[in-house]
Every structure is written in structure tokens, then in C-alpha cells.
Interface confidence: low
């Protein structure tokens, strides 16, 4: 990941965290952790679509995208989009939806994030080739079974000792501002409004920001281009790594990187990627969760906005523009039309939505066929040419036919999987995003 992407990741996470609705009284500020980033990068290099079984007490979010680059904003959007399926008061995820990526992103006690991305000519567990895999690890891990991601209340009213309030987040006294140095895109302080999820799908091309986190920004990753490891950005937005892993791949922390993979794979925790079916010409990305490993399956894939992406890519959720940073390779972040315009089939994941499990076995591997990469394509509102593949445990999602498909990996956490992954892959670009 570039420095900008790292900062963006952290900033987006923090923006999302600061803007949770209902507001959080104990939300900690996230910061980048190089050790976590190195750990995430090392795993990403293995090119496995599934959660790291050796992640120990680390949360994990995965995101994968075909094309030449990672799309951090898109990944965040995908992860954060699951918010629409999560009920905080009941601590449940809507049936058939994923919420784990989202819950990891807004897990109050998680304060360190590290992400890494790697370009994989072949991603184990995925038929698609040339995929940029984003892995984000978190500490302390989120998605603890039986626990809510955060305590509702006045922002900062329950900050731990030694923390002060800043932008509605509890920040360690004397700590540097993590997002302060974001190059190019300095996300504005979260508005602390409940609108964080409402607009998450509509993402502009600007680099991913946490507040209105772009809907599934997917950066295109050229098949032959090895993408840089995505540093774990201290964003509080869930890292909805698109990955289709076999069961047990889900990690608790949502990955922070999104690549512009033509197709996006959504893990079971990508519940609401394309809540509204959307079709994109040429390709759409639908999260194809392969397995949900120890993660709340409630992650949803944020929609990407087609307007602001240059590179082709696909996104699962409604039309949204991609944010600048996340769309590195997703040059065709084309703005996506309203999610309603995206055609997406939803296939129930094998995991029961809302069901909390310490671990989730992804019994159904994504059966999606390899999605062709479509260079020069970008997520588009109407995917006329894209085909949709129904993947087990995948969430519905659509990307512009020109956009790479995106799949969010399962979000695995020490806790449980919230819900099955629903989704289908719209063929052209693939984006794997999922929580395992």
C-alpha cells in the first residue's frame, strides 16, 4: 500500500467509527500499526482467499479485486456498507446478510490496524486470476461473540483513562493524529452523524474517506501488476477484503484494502453489498463469500460509485463513486448508478444471518467461475455486458461492467459470524471482498 493508502485506510476507519449511529460512547481512535501491516502483508503474499488461520488474536478483514491496483475506499465502502444490515441494539445482522466487516471496523476497543496488499496472479480458492488481495488485521480483535461493537451513548463519555476526546473518538493523550499526514486527501473530521452508512454506497472518486465512505471503491489491478502491500491504514472503516475463502478463512478483522480487481469476491460477511440489484455494463462485482471464519458474517460490501473511478472495476453494492485513494488502480471507478440500477442476485449464504459463532466454516466455496478482467472498464451503473455469478456465501453486489469485480472476504473475529454471504459475481471485473 502506498503511504496515502495507509493513511486513507486509517482515516476512513476513524471517520466511520466517529460517525456511527447511534453514537458511540467508547469508540477508540484507530492508528496504523506497522507490525500488523507486516503481518497482513506476509499473509497477503500467500495469495490465499481465506482468513489467516494463524492470525491468533487479531481481527481480520479481506478484500480482493482484479486489475492493477487496490481500492482502499472501495474496500472500506464494502465493509462499511454492511452497517445497513446490522442492528446495534439487538446486536444482530439481518438474515442472509453479512455484518462482520462492519462490526470490526467499528469495534470500539480495536485501536490498531495494519493492512497489506499483494498482487496475486492466482488467488488460491478463486478461479479468477490476477487479483489484488488486501488483508487488514486488527488489534484488539473485534467481533467477539456476545459483544456489541460499541456502547451507545454520548461520544467519548466512556473513554478509558488516559484518553481524551477528539472528533468523537477516544484518542490516547499525547498520541499523534493518525490521519493528519494523509497526502492529497485529508479526510475531514467525521461529521459524527448517522449518515455514515446512508451515503456509503455512493462514492465519489475521491480517495476513500471514512465519513461518506465511497461505496466499494475498487482499484483496478492489472493482472500482471504486482500491487504494493496495502499498509494497514488506521481508518476505522471496516476492511472488507474481498476474498473467497474456503471455510475457516474468515478472520475477525476486516481487511482494509480494496483492489480494483475486475471482480470482487464477497465473503459471507458481505451481506448488503448490493442490497438493490444493480447491473453494470460489462461487469459488476459481487461479493462472493467463500467461507466465514470466526467472523460476524454481517459485513456488507459498500457500493462503489462509478463516476469517480477511472479504472474498470466491479462493485457489489449500488452505484457510488470511488474515493481517490482507494482507486489507485481502479482508474475506472466510474460512478455507479443507484444501487437499484445494479442487477444483483442475492444468494443466501450458508451461514445463518445474525447467527453468532466463534468460528464460521464456509461450507460452500464460492462456485463462481473465474471472472475475466476487463481493462479499461470501470464500475458502471448499468452493467449491460456483465454476467452475474451466484456464489455461495456471497452477497449480492453489482459493479459497473467496466469495473473490476470485488469480493469482500469473510470477516473473522474472535467472535462470531453474523450472517451468510449473499451475492453474485457479475462477470467482468471481479472484486473479492469478504470477511472470513
Amino acid at each position: 500500500l502506498t503511504d496515502e493508502e495507509k493513511r486513507l485506510m486509517v482515516e476512513l476507519h476513524n471517520l466511520y467509527r466517529a460517525q456511527v449511529s447511534p453514537t458511540a460512547s467508547d469508540m477508540l481512535h484507530m492508528r496504523w500499526d506497522e507490525e500488523l501491516a507486516a503481518f497482513a502483508k506476509a499473509y497477503a503474499r500467500q495469495c490465499v482467499w481465506g482468513h489467516n488461520k494463524e492470525r491468533g488474536r487479531r481481527g481480520e478483514n479481506l478484500f480482493a479485486i482484479t486489475d492493477e491496483g487496490m481500492d482502499v475506499p472501495l474496500a472500506m465502502e464494502e465493509w462499511h456498507h454492511e452497517r445497513e444490515h446490522y442492528n446495534l441494539s439487538a446486536a444482530t445482522c439481518s438474515p442472509g446478510q453479512m455484518c462482520g466487516h462492519y462490526t470490526q471496523v467499528v469495534w470500539a476497543k480495536t485501536e490498531r490496524i495494519g493492512c497489506g496488499s499483494h498482487f496475486c496472479e492466482k488467488l488460491q480458492g478463486v478461479e479468477e486470476t490476477n487479483i489484488e488481495l488486501l488483508v487488514c488485521n486488527y488489534e484488539p480483535p473485534g467481533n467477539v461473540k456476545g459483544k456489541r461493537p460499541y456502547q451507545e451513548g454520548t461520544p467519548c463519555s466512556q473513554c478509558p483513562s488516559g484518553y481524551h476526546c477528539k472528533n468523537s473518538l477516544c484518542e490516547p493523550i499525547g498520541s499523534p493524529e493518525d490521519a493528519q499526514d494523509l497526502p492529497y486527501l485529508v479526510t475531514e473530521a467525521p461529521s459524527f452523524r448517522a449518515t455514515e452508512a446512508s451515503d456509503s454506497r455512493k462514492m465519489g472518486t475521491p480517495s476513500s474517506l471514512a465519513t461518506g465512505i465511497p461505496a466499494f471503491l475498487v482499484t483496478e489491478v492489472s493482472g500482471s501488476l504486482a500491487t504494493k502491500a496495502l499498509p494497514a491504514v488506521e481508518t476505522q472503516a471496516p476492511t472488507s477484503l474481498a476474498t473467497k475463502d474456503p471455510p475457516s478463512m474468515a478472520t475477525e478483522a476486516p481487511p482494509c484494502v480494496t483492489t480494483e480487481v475486475p471482480s470482487i469476491l464477497a465473503a459471507h460477511s458481505l451481506p448488503s453489498l448490493d442490497e438493490e440489484p444493480v447491473t453494470f455494463p460489462k461487469s459488476t462485482h459481487v461479493p462472493i463469500p467463500k467461507s466465514a471464519d470466526k467472523v460476524t458474517d454481517k459485513t456488507k460490501v459498500p457500493s462503489r460509485s462509478p463516476e469517480n473511478s477511472l479504472d474498470p472495476k466491479m462493485s457489489l453494492t449500488g452505484a457510488r463513486e470511488l474515493l481517490p485513494h482507494a482507486q489507485e488502480e481502479a482508474e475506472a471507478e466510474a460512478e455507479l448508478p443507484p444501487s437499484s440500477e445494479v442487477l444483483a442476485s442475492v444468494f443466501p449464504a450458508q451461514d445463518k444471518p445474525g447467527e453468532l459463532q466463534a468460528t464460521l466454516d464456509h461450507t460452500g466455496h464460492t462456485s463462481s467461475k473465474s471472472l475475466p478482467n476487463f481493462p479499461n472498464t470501470s464500475a458502471t451503473a448499468n452493467a449491460t455486458g456483465g454476467r452475474a455469478l451466484a456464489l455461495q456465501s456471497s452477497l449480492p453486489g453489482a459493479e459497473g461492467p467496466d469495473k473490476p469485480s470485488v469480493v469482500s472476504g469473510l470477516n473473522s473475529g474472535p467472535g462470531h459470524v453474523w450472517g451468510p454471504l449473499l451475492g453474485l459475481l457479475l462477470l467482468p471485473p471481479l472484486v473479492l471482498a469478504g470477511i472470513f
Epitope: A210, T219, E220, T377
Partner: antibody, heavy 121, light 117 residues
Amino acid sequence: EVLLLESGGGLVHPGGSLKLSCAASGFTFSSYAMSWVRQVPGKGLEWVSTISGGGGYTYFADSVKGRFTISRDNSKDTLYLQMNSLRAEDTAVYFCAKDLGSRAQGWFDPWGQGTLVTVSS
Amino acid sequence: QPVLTQPSSHSASSGASVRLTCMLSSGFSVGDFWIRWYQQKPGNPPRYLLYYHSDSNKGQGSGVPSRFSGSNDASANAGILRISGLQPEDEADYYCGTWHSNSKTFIFGSGTKVTVL
């Protein structure tokens, strides 16, 4: 410090060709998408083309499609714009700009100083 | 593909607040786009200022003063660049732009020349 320096501009006759270069420094060139944006003196900005960090994806404005080719040599940290079948309306200052990531997203930041291309008989 | 329309000029006194609009053509919703804003002073290349998609999805360019902020006017289907506390050095041309993924092209607005009185 990120620096972008365009070169190769000049006077060319209609129907002629010209190749612009943009030497980049101060950042990992291959990690970023790069673009060309032009501006007719005294007029507005017009996006011309973008290429992803790895060079696998290229995008062009309809006005130049089929005539212009964008490429990059990541080993030389250089961006190129091959302009063929030039027309008078292609006369403009051509800027190269860095994107925020490897994907083309239209996040032009920063920009080079530009190089003037004049197409005239 | 969408068209971004900007007023050709805008004059305001130093210290005033300026609201520049970038109207999206009919058939497109500004909420679906990431509107970026660029500033260009005479003789200089453009400078990236910020982008805006929603209140929760926006960002400033590096070193861009907080006096510059973005927003959307849904009723007008336009992106907004607000410059508060206008200063003489803000006199420049301002361009909005956005990427249109359907056509895979980047679109610039026609630009607004801001004059500080």
C-alpha cells in the same frame, strides 16, 4: 518532493506526430496511475488520458481516442503520450498529473508545469 | 456522459464567503459522483483542492486550508465549493471534475474565475 516534468512539446503540422514525456521523481512511480490533461491557453481543462500504475489499463477522452497512446516506462519513471494525426484543436498546454493510487481515479495531484503543443500549418 | 456546468465568473470581496457551483447534467445524480475541485492561478498548473461525495466521504488535498470545503446541493444537483474568508490569493480559476465510470472518462467543469474585490 513529488516532481513531474513534461517535455516534448513544440510546433507540429496538422497530421503530424509528437511524443510527450513526463519525468517523475519523489515517489514510487509504478504505484500510481498517471494522467495527461490539457488546456488550451485561456480556456478550461480537458482530461486526455490516464494509465494505471502497472500500465495495464488505459483510458482516453473521445476526442483523442484512436489518435493518442498513453504509456509508461516504470523502470525509467517516465510517462509518455504519443500523439498522432494531430489537429489544430489539439493545440494546448499538456500537463501530466499523478493520481492517488495505482488505479486511475482522476485524482490529479500534483501536476507538472506543462508543455505547450502547437499544431499549426 | 455527464456534463459539469460552472458559472464563468464570480466576484466577491475579501473576507466574504464564496459558493461556487458545479451543476451536473440531468439524468445524473450528484450524490453518485465524487466531485473534485481544482484551483488554478494564472501561469500555474492546477492544484488539487478537495473532493466531496457526502458529509461522510470527503477529503482535503494536502496543505489545502480548511477555508475550502465541499458539499452538495441535491436540489440543484450540484457540487459546491465553499471558500470562507476569501483572501486575495484565492483569486484563481476553479474547476470541478469527476470520473464517470460508465464511460471511463474524467470530466472537468468549464471552470469559474473568482475575482477578489
